[in-house]
Amino acid sequence: FPMFKRGRCLCIGPGVKAVKVADIEKASIMYPSNNCDKIEVIITLKENKGQRCLNPKSKQARLIIKKVERKNF
């Protein structure tokens, strides 16, 4: 049922390659689950500019994931 699981992901499309660091309010990582079969990196932008999905394969996303994992474990 991969299509069903993918249909419930928060990010649609591949995500942006990068977000200006100065614009980032916070970063959230959603790990694969029953709802979505892929890792998702969601950036909350400053000044109520909404949220963006970051391409989890991008260099910036990999750095964020590493940073968050170091912090949590």
Epitope: C11, I12, G13
Partner: nanobody, 130 residues
Framework: EVQLVESGGGLVQAGGSLRLSCAAA?????????ISWFRQAPGKDREFVAA???????????EYADSVKGRFTISRDNAKNTAYLEMNSLKFEDTAVYYC???????????????????WGQGTQVTVSS
């Protein structure tokens, strides 16, 4: 950088049809872009009309504002890097400037929010006369 150019607007009688086009000047990842149409009537806020996004497989999903459901259809031709908004049974209330927007990093729950999109066209005027 994606540049979007809308066309196809004009003056039409109530009950008539129009087809708006949104051409992306630099294709690149057009296939995977979430494409949305918004509209803005004089003195009103920009409002969501329709969106279409890549399923991650070979199909697209679409979502519509309640006010246009069953009358408007969003589609795209990736070979031409162009998205379309087919508008049927037009009403006087559909009069507005129509904008297309594109983004690669759209969050599913925020698809109707203008701030979710990175690229915008200049708009095309649609006037429906009664």
């Amino acid at each position: 950088e994606v540049q979007l150019v809308e066309s196809g607007g004009g003056l039409v009688q109530a009950g008539g049809s129009l087809r708006l086009s949104c051409a992306a000047a630099s294709g690149g990842t057009f296939t995977k872009q979430t494409i949305s149409w918004f509209r803005q009537a004089p003195g009103k806020d920009r409002e969501f009309v329709a969106a279409q996004w890549w399923s991650g497989l070979s199909t697209y999903f679409a979502e519509y504002a309640d006010s246009v459901k069953g009358r408007f259809t969003i589609s795209r031709d990736n070979a031409k890097n162009t998205a379309y908004l087919e508008m049927n049974s037009l009403k006087f209330e559909d009069t507005a400037v129509y904008y297309c927007a594109a983004g690669l990093g759209v969050v599913r729950t925020l698809i109707r929010r203008a701030s979710s999109y990175d690229y915008w066209g200049q708009g095309t005027q649609v006037t429906v006369s009664s």
